[in-house]
């Protein structure tokens, strides 16, 4: 399984249909500014085995996704965009999906880091709670897309790792 | 390793233009602003503009906007700082620094060594 | 725009000694605010960042407090290489602004 090659070149496409999202220029929204407190630990590690590293990385591009089919969220963004954006992100959850049940067999480990997993949930569930405060306002959702470009690249180096691990 | 690079010290004369750069490495060039601050001999640090280099959109102090042009070329990860006709009042050390846009991160944490600008007749 | 006013302008200390700065905004700022070091000849360097956050690489004795319009920069221990001057910046809102200075000369 060639998940980081791939799965690399998915982030990268999603990197860009982000960027090209921003509706308001993100000047006006300084004093929006929030710390999410990005669950870098989880990411930091080298004690993970692959299919777990697969399901911690899966766990963000499913609430990422999350984020992005929400109702609140459509009335925000380009429709053809955010409909690139989530196809994007489907196809890696489907291609992560395949490679962790390859791994199966390999591993003797548990398929699941359960800590790390909470970790990235309780992250979104940051990020949801601080757009409800907000009540969705532009500002906050150009926040909180500059917030996930941030994670998808330093998670963008995780992926990097684990490839050179192999 | 973060760096900032700027050009070298310019000496013009009154009405001449100047194009100053500053030149990011170490890090992903469009992922951060690029602000630009002028301090004037014996004063103190003054905020000039910022640009996002992933588009190119631009934001001006007052105090500034229409005496400068901020641009940039995220192709060789470069912000330019310019002026179309120089006045003495220009003469200022001119220093880019690195900023993190919405991101939950410090403000202005690496800085350039800064372009010395002498305009003189 | 958001002035920003640093005091005292100057100040003499004795390494060893502690060492207070304040920064007053005219307005609420919250804790977007942030403080550089400056050393003749040199760019400026952050110290601290969002009020209280100690950059990486900056030694423990510079610490920061304050919220809404006040706020600190104290130098617990001043060393030799602390002498130099200091700003505080407000970050919440464009134009961006930077206090007046403070300059930390040796008695």
């Known amino acids: 399984c060639d998940l980081p090659q791939t799965h690399s070149l998915g982030n990268r496409r999603a990197l860009i249909l982000l960027a090209q999202m921003g509706r308001i220029s993100p000047f006006s929204c300084l004093k929006d500014r929030h710390d999410f407190g990005f669950p870098q630990e989880e990411f930091d590690g080298n004690q993970f085995q692959k299919a777990q590293a697969i399901s911690v990385l899966h766990e963000m591009i499913q609430q990422t996704f999350n984020l992005f089919s929400t109702k609140d969220s459509s009335a925000t963004w380009e429709q053809s965009l955010l409909e690139k954006f989530s196809t994007e992100l489907n196809q890696q959850l489907n291609d992560m999906e395949a490679c962790v049940i390859q791994e199966v067999g390999v591993e003797e480990t548990p398929l699941m880091n359960v800590d790390s997993i909470l970790a990235v949930k309780k992250y979104f569930q940051r990020i949801t709670l601080y757009l409800t405060e907000k009540k969705y306002s532009p500002c906050a959702w150009e926040v909180v897309r500059a917030e996930i470009m941030r994670s998808f690249s330093l998670s963008k180096i995780f992926q990097e790792r684990l490839r050179r691990k192999e | 390793e973060v760096q900032l690079v700027q050009s070298g010290a310019e000496v013009k004369k009154p009405g001449e233009s100047l194009k100053i750069s500053c030149k990011g490495s170490g890090y992903s060039f469009t992922s951060y602003w690029i602000g630009w601050v002028r301090q004037m001999p014996g004063k103190g640090l003054e905020w000039m503009g910022i640009i996002d280099p992933s588009d190119s959109d631009t934001a001006y102090s007052p105090s500034f906007q229409g005496q400068v042009t901020i641009s940039a070329d995220k192709s060789i990860s470069t912000a330019y700082l310019q002026w179309s006709s120089l006045k003495a009042s220009d003469t200022a050390m001119y220093y880019c620094a690195r900023h993190p846009g919405l991101n939950w991160a410090p403000d202005f944490d690496y800085w350039g060594q800064g372009t010395l600008v002498t305009v003189s007749s | 725009d958001i002035q920003m006013t640093q005091s005292p302008s100057s100040l003499s200390a004795s390494v060893g000694d502690r060492v207070t700065i304040t920064c007053r905004a005219s307005q609420s700022i919250a804790e977007f605010l942030n403080w550089y070091q400056q050393k003749p000849g040199k760019a400026p360097k952050l110290l601290i960042y969002f009020a209280s956050s100690l950059q990486s690489g900056v030694p423990s004795r510079f610490s920061g407090s304050g919220s809404g319009t006040d706020f600190t920069l104290t130098i617990s221990s001043l060393q030799p290489e602390d002498f130099a001057t200091y700003y505080c910046?407000?970050?919440?809102?464009?134009?961006?602004?930077f206090g007046q200075g403070t300059k930390v000369e040796i008695k």
């Open positions: 910046q407000q970050s919440i809102d464009f134009p961006l602004t």
